[in-house]
């Protein structure tokens, strides 16, 4: 999908000028305000193991598991979101990839993503209003790290 | 600043009518809020060591531990994205966070992630020319994971 | 053509496990989210969850998290579903079912647009 | 979870007639509702995405509309091999959820 940038365009309702053409037109609007995923992920997943495997993805052969869940939301930009899930409170040891070592913590890797979330744009009605996009930060646990805990001075 | 995406307009040039008003765009002051990297760059970031740190940011205190590099570029949404550059081969042993163990490959996790570029419309010239955002994917490294080696079957 | 090739039925003691497999073909494997939907007494459809062949990511409807494990071998393009602690309340026919996506990007519309002839798994002891 | 629920479990029809079954959601759905035939022998196929588009395929008697929360899917001109169980199912949110099935009959 393509863009167009308009200028002079930073609030709304400026941003969805009427006197376009009537198909349905998305519009950005910025706003820095973050959101957080639907709910917290705890590290107690459902049917996976905590175990480093071989082979298959990196998510699985590492000594600090995780699964992907899916986050769908229609009204945002991207729709699909993956959030991490630690399979274990600790790291798998590398020798056996099974068993835990308290030496390690599998902590996840949160980051603050960009997304858009379509909004009807202020004072449009009708069949064929158009949307305004607000931009947000979203919060993402894109991976889990074996870490090693944290000492307090 | 807002955008406009257009329905039906995947492919460029058709997404810039050329009917809309003349004043210059300044492109981009939108996205001057620069997204951080997801755990906060260390003061330390030129002589970064193969070692897992007992506190600071999650990349230092990861046995694959990672500096962030950053990746800017004004004519891309975001401008700013960083890169995870992986500080060791092997992952550091949870005991003394400084020897490596042989038995954890330290690699850097890929992600596809959604970027807008700014193209000029096809088109338009002169100097009040407007510009498309055209949607691509760009290949990022997110963290570092300590990972069991692969076996081939 | 794309097709949905589910195993054949199963009978299963109570407590017991069974995998089902769906083998596609006719598309890229990859590029498509697979749902799996239950439908007992050969009435109600209800959907189990959904993974991403892509990335393993998966959602699941509450009840069915610890019942149900969705995985996939992309090598031979086959989406599997592990039903564990079998009781007769999970005697039902199973189905998968490729999500396709629709509408101008960025905002698709889903739908379970080619589906698999179903698994009948039985729990009896 | 949203709810979806048709009211009509079975309906008897002839051949030729129009036929209209309703589907509701216990909150608006915003049009992001697709409709399924299921066919005696098991087999399932889309009819209907996004409340009112075609599938592809789909003969063109097949129809969909509504909003908010209510539903419909009507067939114009009732042929032998629509005689089957159809089901709404909505995408808004997740888990997607179903419609207990309306059972088409011939009269």
């Known amino acids: 999908v393509s863009l167009r940038i308009q200028e002079g365009c930073s609030h709304l309702p400026s941003c969805c000028p009427s006197k376009e053409q009537e198909p349905p037109e998305e519009w950005l609007k910025w706003s820095s305000a973050s959101v957080s995923p639907p709910e917290p992920l705890s590290h107690t997943h459902h049917a996976e193991s905590c175990r480093a495997s071989k082979d298959g993805p990196l998510n699985s052969r590492a000594i600090s598991p995780w699964s992907y869940e899916l986050d769908r939301d229609l009204n945002r930009v991207p729709q699909d979101l993956y959030h991490a899930r630690c399979l274990c409170p600790h790291c798998v040891s590398l020798q056996t990839g099974s068993h835990m070592d308290p030496l390690g913590n599998s902590v996840p890797l949160y980051h603050n993503q960009t997304v858009f979330y379509r909004r009807p744009c202020h004072g449009e009605e009708g069949t064929h209003r158009r949307y305004c996009l607000e931009r947000r930060l979203y919060r993402v646990s894109l991976a889990c790290v074996c870490v090693r805990p944290r000492v307090m001075a | 600043v807002s955008l406009r995406i257009q329905e039906g307009c995947s492919h460029l040039p058709s997404c810039c009518p050329s009917k809309e008003q003349e004043p210059p765009e300044e492109w981009l002051k939108w996205s001057s809020a620069s997204v951080s990297p997801p755990e906060p760059l260390s003061h330390t970031h030129h002589a970064e060591s193969c070692r897992a740190s007992k506190d600071g940011p999650l990349n230092s205190r990861a046995i694959s531990p990672w500096s962030y590099e950053l990746d800017r570029d004004l004519n891309r949404v975001p401008q700013d994205l960083y890169h995870a550059r992986c500080l060791c081969p092997h992952c550091v042993s949870l005991q003394t966070g400084s020897h490596m163990d042989p038995l954890g490959n330290s690699v850097p996790l890929y992600h596809n992630q959604t970027v807008f570029y700014r193209r000029p419309c096809h088109g338009e010239e002169g100097t009040h020319r407007r510009y498309c955002l055209e949607r691509r994917l760009y290949r990022v490294s997110l963290a570092c994971v300590c990972v069991r080696p692969r076996v081939m079957a | 053509e794309v097709q949905l090739q589910q195993s054949g039925p199963e009978l299963v003691k109570p407590g017991g496990s069974v995998r089902i497999s769906c083998k596609a073909s006719g598309y890229s494997f990859t590029g498509y989210t697979m749902n799996w939907v239950k439908q007992s007494h050969g009435k109600n459809l209800e959907w189990i969850g959904l993974?991403?062949?892509?990335?393993?990511?998966?959602s699941h409807k509450q009840r069915f998290m610890g019942k149900a494990t969705l995985t996939v071998d992309k090598s031979s393009s086959t989406a599997y579903m592990e039903l564990l602690s079998l009781t007769s309340e999970d005697s039902a026919v199973y189905y998968c079912?490729?999500?396709?996506?629709?509408?101008?990007?960025?905002?698709?519309?889903?739908?379970?647009?080619?589906w698999g002839q179903g698994t009948s798994v039985t729990v009896s002891s | 979870d949203i709810q979806m629920t048709q009211t009509t479990s079975s309906l008897s029809a002839s051949l030729g007639d129009r036929v209209t079954i309703s589907c509701s959601a216990s909150q608006d759905i915003s049009n992001y509702l697709n409709w399924y035939q299921q066919k005696p022998d098991g087999t399932i196929k889309l009819l209907i995405y996004y409340t009112s588009t075609l599938h592809s395929g789909v003969p063109s008697r097949f129809s969909g509309s509504g909003s908010g929360t209510d539903y419909s899917l009507t067939i114009s001109n009732l042929e032998p091999e629509d005689i089957a169980t159809y089901y709404c199912q909505q995408y808004s949110k997740l888990p997607y959820t179903f419609g207990g099935g309306t059972k088409l009959e011939i009269k």
């Open positions: 993974i991403n062949p892509d990335n393993g990511g998966t």
């Open positions: 079912a490729r999500e396709g996506y629709y509408g101008p990007s960025p905002f698709h519309h889903y739908a379970m647009d080619y």
